[in-house]
């Protein structure tokens, strides 16, 4: 980078290297090059010369002043028209950068997603910082007082084995940068109310050529947790709204889910379960698309990414989808 | 030679305010910032805030953020230092420092300042 | 904010000893380090700028090194009027900070 180069003098920033974004901050430059009194001194950024806000404060020294200065990150550098020499000469560089002490984090989320062996805690950072931000989450046990320090730049996965002070544990985030440090609020936790189960997976969809045509959607789950509450929620592709619906659910067989719906229309699918009356949920499943026969029977399977149509009474079609706006994996 | 000369000692009450002032001298006092900096008896050095005596521009420590201002007067060359709803644990001796090399290259000789009902 | 560690926090040498204090950074601050020496009831006096450059009428018994988080304060030969205390600062952000200082006595 440019704070590699052999210098010639100095440059220096006032009042820090790293200083709030939309500051008002000094640039010095000051030239120590032998047989040379220079007879101007230039500022360089990101190697376009600066020609503004420049003021020479003595024989080997000049100030460049940026008022509001919004940019992340700078290369800086500094040179002296020397007499009797063709080029400019190279004084000196620096970079600069400019950003945002962190917000307080907030909404700490901490779940064990079943069979993954980890505790995974999220929260909100609020604004963009611009500079390097850390975080460290720290996990004390209600039981030992014991506390754990976990350094991380985003989320943190936690091995539930390391959690050995029992079930009841405080948690909380620090967030700190080069211009500031916040701390959330603390998050009260019993892991046992905190496990989401395995993902559900809506795998297909038939619809039955009956006097009212119903479309039944097999969905089903690996959890070995015995109540599990689940939505299941639809729509038509052309329709902003949802329809939801609820199941109590025991995933020792395959789920099989009844809806009437409009003949020869696009649906998608979508499902999520939780733990019965604990607090968090899956994200939704990926999308899941079905569209409705106008006579013709039809079963929609995982395998395939594109519509067939046949006039059999079992046809496979599309399927698969992927997350979109609408589809956040949100676990609140 | 750079000289920065600090007003004299002061005893200050509880909840008042106290300002500081620096003067400036064999230099230009335009071309640099001010940074002030306090020691409490025995301990150590404390950064609280920063001037730029030309600009104006002031940076504070957030641990003073609201209770401290900092001033400059370029026609007499002087930077002051005030710090309003004082507690005892404020009793230290407040330094200037000369900002140069991003570094502090000056020092005032250092004004105590003693909080005490 | 940054975090400045020195240590020791007091060490006990003899004139001609060779003496070393260590700053470390709680993060990478580049070569934005300065070194302070401070007697009682004196202002600090700047003897390092930048990490290593010698601030001038400085003796050249006193050099520092380091970049990122540690730093060296070397006193290659330490001389009576050395005995003091001596103080890292950091000027890669504001806040502006100091370590906590490092104690030189006589031994």
């Known amino acids: 980078g440019i704070t590699n180069i052999n210098c010639s003098g100095h440059i220096w920033v006032e009042p820090a290297t790293i200083f709030k974004m939309g500051m008002n901050i000094s640039i010095y430059c000051q030239a120590a090059i032998k047989n040379c009194q220079p007879r101007k001194l230039h500022f360089y950024k990101n190697g376009i010369k600066e020609r503004f806000q420049i003021t020479r404060i003595n024989k080997t020294t000049a100030r460049l002043w940026y008022k509001n200065f919004l940019e992340p990150h700078a290369s800086m550098y500094c040179t002296a028209e020397c007499p009797k020499h063709f080029q400019e000469t190279l004084i000196c560089g620096k970079d600069i950068s400019s950003g945002y002490p962190p917000d307080i984090p907030d909404e700490v989320t901490c779940v064990i997603y079943e069979y993954s062996g980890n505790m995974t805690c999220t929260w909100n950072a609020g604004k963009l910082t611009y500079i390097d931000t850390k975080y460290v989450v720290h996990v004390k046990s209600l039981e030992t007082e014991e506390e754990q320090q976990y350094l991380t730049s985003s989320y943190i996965n936690i091995s539930t084995d390391s959690l050995q002070g029992g079930k009841k544990y405080l948690v909380w985030v620090q967030a700190a940068n080069a211009l500031g440090m916040e701390e959330s609020k603390q998050l009260q936790i019993h892991l046992d109310d905190i496990v989401i189960p395995s993902a559900a997976v809506i795998s297909r969809a038939e619809t039955i050529n009956a006097t009212v045509p119903k479309t039944i959607i097999y969905w089903d789950s690996q959890t070995t947790i015995e109540k599990v509450s689940c939505e299941m929620r639809y729509k038509a592709t052309t329709n902003q709204t949802w329809n939801v619906k609820e199941f109590d659910t025991n995933f020792t067989y395959v789920q099989q889910s009844e809806f009437y719906l409009e003949p020869n229309i696009k649906y998608v699918f979508q499902v999520r379960c939780q733990e019965t009356g604990k607090r968090y949920w899956q994200p939704w499943s990926s999308l899941f698309f079905h569209k409705t026969p106008e006579t013709v029977p039809q079963v929609t399977s995982k395998a395939f990414q594109h519509d067939t149509w046949n006039s059999g009474l079992t046809v496979a079609s599309i399927s698969t989808g992927h997350l979109t706006s609408d589809n956040r994996g949100d676990i609140g | 030679q750079v000289q920065l000369v600090q007003s004299g000692a002061e005893v200050k009450k509880p909840g008042s305010s106290v300002k500081v002032s620096c003067k400036a001298s064999g230099g230009t006092f335009s071309s640099y910032g001010i940074s002030w900096v306090r020691q409490a008896p025995g301990q150590g050095l404390e950064w609280m805030g920063w001037?730029?005596?030309?600009?104006?521009?002031?940076n504070y420590a957030q641990k003073f953020q609201g209770r401290v201002t900092i001033t400059a007067d370029e026609s007499t060359s002087t930077a002051y230092m005030e710090l309003s709803s004082l507690r005892s644990e404020d009793t230290a001796v407040y330094y200037c420092a000369r900002h140069w090399l991003q570094s502090f290259d000056y020092w005032g000789q250092g004004t105590l300042v003693t909080v005490s009902s | 904010d940054i975090q400045m560690t020195q240590s020791p926090s007091s060490l006990s040498a003899s004139v001609g000893d060779r003496v070393t204090i260590t700053c470390r950074a709680s993060?990478?601050?580049?070569?934005?380090l300065n070194w302070y020496q401070q007697k009682p009831g004196k202002a600090p006096k700047l003897l390092i700028y930048a990490a290593s450059s010698l601030q001038s009428g400085v003796p050249s018994r006193f050099s520092g090194s380091g970049s990122g988080t540690d730093f060296t304060l070397t006193i290659s030969s330490l001389q009576p009027e050395d005995f003091a205390t001596y103080y890292c600062?950091?000027?890669?952000?504001?806040?502006?900070?100091f370590g906590q200082g490092t104690k030189v006595e006589i031994k």
């Open positions: 001037i730029s005596a030309i600009f104006g521009t002031t």
């Open positions: 600062q950091q000027s890669y952000s504001t806040p502006l900070t």
């Open positions: 993060q990478s601050i580049g070569g934005d």
